[in-house]
């Protein structure tokens, strides 16, 4: 590692970002007293003056909701955070630069399975983001990613699964056994970006054949 | 007022290594990126790197990576370029640069020579 | 690498006259997020480490004086003295930060005619 820490008030300033949230977060060194308080400040790159975040001054959470401040996800992002406590001086700690666009993670999706006799449809929601667009409208993932897809799973059993993927939000595994457990999985890819979310999940069984 | 000073510069043999500070004052190193810059006699600029004093991470001009290498120690204020294997081009005055994109501070540059 | 080209090399000027500076750049220098173009302007005089007159292409540095302007999009951009002084003898250099690694231009020499 190329940089000595020995201040010990402050430690780990970094962005988690999943679906374009982007939040601000950061630990207290060994240091830190009760009465620490810290302060945020942000700014894009290139620009020369830090903006300081109404709400995350002199507070005492570790974290910092910094969504609107960021909501560009074509734009890189620093933010700072300055830590003061009785007796000492301030320390000041910034974060590598931030892309949401880059560094964001992709929640899984929100998804319906509806179960037939002999089928099971899974339906995908649209996930909003904080991102606007030019009209400022909330943008989808679909929206930001124009490469994203869904995989779909359907473990039949220990040894067989039925796969599907594409671009649409509806899809149906037909040929199914009524009367039977399924689980079902769905996951979001972005390939350009080499996204992947955790899978969303279901256990559905299928109806039971009346006729 | 923000300050940086440079020092460690001076004649090494080729193959030799240095290393260079950078003494920042009137604020934190920890607020803003450092950049080493360099700039052979007669000649123009040539920038090596970066570093977030902050966190550690480093860019570099692939032209120095594995030769030069960026740190910093946040208690002294200080950013440091270690160069290894010096060769007769590495001639210039090495300056350390303030900020992430373009360079609103710079130090008064310090001299390297390598001869034999 | 984007290479950054100068023009001219030097330039002689008599004091109170106009002296442009030209840079062109290898590839557009044009930041979509802000429409605004990654270009800085440095002076450098004798003995003295470059100092910061110009950033993003056209906005000026904290007390710089106004006969400094930059201008330009793209690919070609423009530093322009309006009436020389005898204080504004040095080398001028333009610099990129739209890539790593960030790049300058050879220097332009400004000298009184």
């Known amino acids: 590692h190329t940089t000595e820490d020995t201040s010990g008030l402050l430690r780990h300033v970094k962005f988690q970002s999943s679906n374009f949230e982007n939040i601000l977060t950061w630990d207290a060194g060994p240091a830190s007293a009760p009465d620490t308080v810290y302060s945020v400040e942000y700014k894009k790159y290139g620009e020369k003056e830090w903006l300081a975040k109404a709400g995350c001054q002199r507070i005492t959470q570790k974290f910092c909701n910094l969504t609107v401040e960021t909501r560009n996800h074509t734009e890189f992002y620093y933010a700072k955070v300055t830590a003061v406590s009785s007796g000492g001086p301030p320390v000041t700690k910034m974060t590598d630069r931030f892309s949401s666009l880059q560094h964001t993670t992709i929640r899984p999706p929100d998804v319906t399975c509806i179960p037939k006799v002999r089928s099971i449809q899974m339906l995908v929601h649209p996930t909003l983001t904080p991102v606007l667009s030019e009209d400022g409208h909330q943008l989808t993932l679909e929206e930001i990613f124009h490469d994203l897809f869904y995989r779909l799973k359907l473990h039949v059993n220990h040894t067989y699964q039925m796969n599907l993927e594409g671009k649409q939000r509806e899809y149906e595994f037909l040929g199914l056994t009524p009367d039977t457990e399924f689980l079902g999985s769905i996951t979001i890819l972005t390939p350009i970006l080499s996204k992947e979310s955790a899978p969303y999940t279901c256990r559905v069984k299928t109806l039971p054949d009346r006729t | 007022e923000v300050q940086l000073v440079e020092s460690g510069g001076g004649l090494v043999q080729p193959g030799g290594s240095l290393r260079l500070s950078c003494a920042a004052s009137?604020?934190?190193?920890?607020?803003?990126?450092m950049n080493w810059v360099r700039q052979a006699p007669g000649k123009g600029l040539e920038w090596i790197g970066e570093i977030n004093p902050s966190t550690g991470t480093t860019t570099y001009n692939q032209k120095f990576k594995g030769r030069f290498t960026i740190s910093v120690d946040q208690s002294k204020n200080t950013a440091y370029l270690q160069m290894n294997s010096l060769r007769a081009e590495d001639t210039a005055v090495y300056y350390c640069?303030?900020?992430?994109?373009?360079?609103?501070?710079w130090g008064q540059g310090t001299l390297v020579t390598v001869s034999s | 690498d984007i290479v950054m080209t100068q023009s001219p090399d030097s330039l002689a000027v008599s004091l109170g006259e106009r002296a442009t500076i030209n840079c062109k750049s290898s590839?557009?220098?044009?930041?979509?997020?802000?429409?605004?173009?990654?270009l800085a302007w440095y002076q450098q005089k004798p003995g003295q480490p470059p100092k910061l007159l110009i950033y993003?292409?056209?906005s000026r540095e904290s007390g710089v004086p106004d006969r400094f302007s930059g201008s330009g999009s793209g690919t070609d951009f423009t530093l322009t003295i309006s009436s020389l002084q005898a204080e504004d003898v040095a080398v001028y250099y333009c610099q990129q930060y739209y890539s790593y690694p960030f790049t300058f231009g050879q220097g332009t020499k400004v000298e009184i005619k």
């Open positions: 640069a303030r900020f992430d994109a373009y360079f609103d501070y």
């Open positions: 993003w292409a056209s």
């Open positions: 590839q557009s220098l044009l930041y979509s997020s802000n429409q605004k173009n990654t």
């Open positions: 009137g604020y934190s190193i920890t607020a803003e990126y």
